[in-house]
Interface confidence: low
């Protein structure tokens, strides 16, 4: 029988023979995970425990900031004998369990990363049946979210009121980029309505395209800029677009 213990970075410190239980509580997480804003990241977490063949109810929890005390960002519960961990909490719907807690794996996937997601995350498992035991990673995994240069993900021309047309431009980046429209109107630019950003995505609308020609959307943040264009040709009242 083997007892293992790991340090903050998950390196094996010692193994020594001893009597039951076969394992003691431990959690293995990497020291750091790096990802770019807008992408997804996986926070690995595996554990060992002293309760052989535990098949009772369990709860898997991830929290941010501080161990034991920080706010929960994810929680799921598995019924006795079930391998399905039913999600009870997923902050902003961006967290989901990748691992199988029944197989000692609490790994978590975080979608649509923003810079604000940077920080420490701590995994925790609770055996809520007869075993009545629980454990939480002490050191946690540090998630580093790096900034992302702007990228225009959609640009389009749509029918507007009174036979007019409007243009939409959606870009992503972290920090969220500033959007600007330019076009064939006098002064070569038109005022854009900056829409609500969703996480790392920003949308700007040009509400009335008054002339045919090329309309360009420019997205810029501290890491760079991107631009894309649409062309408006009013043949028989139908718009044509090109990027």
């Amino acid at each position: 029988l083997v007892k293992t213990r790991r340090d903050a970075s998950g390196d094996l410190l010692n193994t020594e023979a001893h009597s039951a239980p076969a394992q003691r509580w431990s959690m293995q997480v990497p020291a750091e995970v790096n990802a770019e804003a807008g992408d997804a990241a996986v926070l690995p977490c595996t554990f060992t425990h002293p309760h052989r063949h535990y098949d009772g109810p369990l709860t898997a929890i991830w929290r941010s900031g501080e161990p034991y005390a920080g706010p929960q960002v994810f929680r799921c519960t598995a019924a006795p004998g079930s391998e399905l961990c039913q999600t009870a909490l997923s902050l902003h719907g961006r967290f989901r369990l990748l691992g199988n807690p029944r197989r000692n794996d609490l790994s978590l996937r975080v979608e649509r990363l923003a810079l604000a997601d940077s920080g420490r995350y701590f995994c925790r498992v609770e055996f809520t049946g007869d075993a009545h035991d629980r454990y939480e990673s002490r050191h946690g995994v540090r998630l580093r979210v790096t900034a992302a240069a702007p990228r225009i993900v959609n640009i389009s021309v749509l029918p507007g009121p009174a036979h007019a047309f409007r243009a939409l431009c959606t870009a992503e980046g972290e920090p969220p980029p500033a959007l600007a429209w330019s076009g064939p109107a006098p002064g070569n630019s038109s005022a854009a309505l900056q829409g609500q950003g969703h996480g790392y995505q920003v949308t700007a609308e040009l509400p009335a395209l008054t002339r045919d020609g090329r309309y360009t959307c420019t997205a810029a943040n501290s890491l760079g800029r991107a631009e894309a264009s649409v062309y408006l040709f009013r043949f028989h009242g139908a718009p044509g677009t090109s990027t």
């Epitope: 239980p21 002293p50 034991y68 920080g70 454990y135 002490r138």
Partner: antibody, heavy 120, light 108 residues
Framework: QVQLVQSGGGVVQPGRSLRLSCAAS????????MHWVRQAPGKGLEWVAV????????YYADSVKGRFTISRDNSKNTLYLQMNSLRAEDTAVYYC?????????????WGQGTLVTVSS | QSVLTQPPSVSVAPGKTARITCGGN??????VHWYQQKPGQAPVLVIY???DRPSGIPERFSGSNSGNTATLTISRVEAGDEADYYC???????????FGGGTKLTVL
């Protein structure tokens, strides 16, 4: 720096009540479980009670269950211990302590202690 | 409920190594924490989770835990190490924290 400053101790007659306070500063009080630990004169440390970071979970030593109530006011960064039906054997120095680490928590910061004497 | 047994006293000469034990049924499966308390002062955490040392605690303090015994080891003992030492665990069956009875370390 982390500080836990206690108040409220004193001499009280058996059967009476007393409330201890522990004012926290230098850390995010609302993110930590907090404990009370006591030490009778010339004796060892005895754990008394714990309250979770949000106040939703409380556990007590058998010796004080039903008589003592642990509570917290996160808006005031303060921990409390309401002691009712006091007995002579409750005479001790009472410490508040912050829980650090995992659920198998240790006490990483302690208050200075306040003496409670139950005597007629 | 966990019961932790410590020797009431341990004596050691300056510069030597002191070992303070904490006995408990299968204590090796639990995380053990150690505190130092000097007269008239609040306890101070010296070892947590069996063998980890808080910042500010000298490297002379170390811990181990296996089987039915956890051990606090103080190497190159100094006069300033004279104090009471307590072990502590979490009792999963009751959600209580449990202290050992304490050991008085005397530096001869």
């Amino acid at each position: 720096q982390v500080q836990l400053v206690q108040s409220g101790g004193g001499v009280v007659q058996p059967g009476r009540s007393l409330r201890l306070s522990c004012a926290a500063s230098g850390f995010t009080f609302s993110s930590y479980a907090m404990h009370w630990v006591r030490q009778a004169p010339g004796k060892g440390l005895e754990w008394v009670a714990v309250i979770s970071y949000d106040g939703s979970n409380k556990y007590y030593a058998d010796s004080v269950k039903g008589r003592f109530t642990i509570s917290r006011d996160n808006s005031k960064n303060t921990l409390y211990l309401q002691m009712n039906s006091l007995r002579a054997e409750d005479t001790a120095v009472y410490y508040c302590a912050r829980e650090g680490g995992s659920y198998y928590g240790y006490f990483d910061y302690w208050g200075q202690g306040t003496l409670v004497t139950v005597s007629s | 409920q966990s019961v932790l047994t410590q020797p009431p006293s341990v004596s050691v000469a300056p510069g030597k190594t002191a070992r303070i034990t904490c006995g408990g049924n299968n204590i090796g499966s639990k995380s053990v924490h150690w505190y130092q308390q000097k007269p008239g002062q609040a306890p101070v955490l010296v070892i947590y989770d069996d063998s980890d040392r808080p910042s500010g605690i000298p490297e002379r303090f170390s811990g181990s835990n296996s089987g039915n015994t956890a051990t606090l080891t103080i190497s190159r003992v100094e006069a300033g190490d004279e104090a009471d030492y307590y072990c502590q665990v979490w009792d999963s069956s009751s959600d209580h924290r449990v202290f050992g009875g304490g050991t008085k370390l005397t530096v001869l």
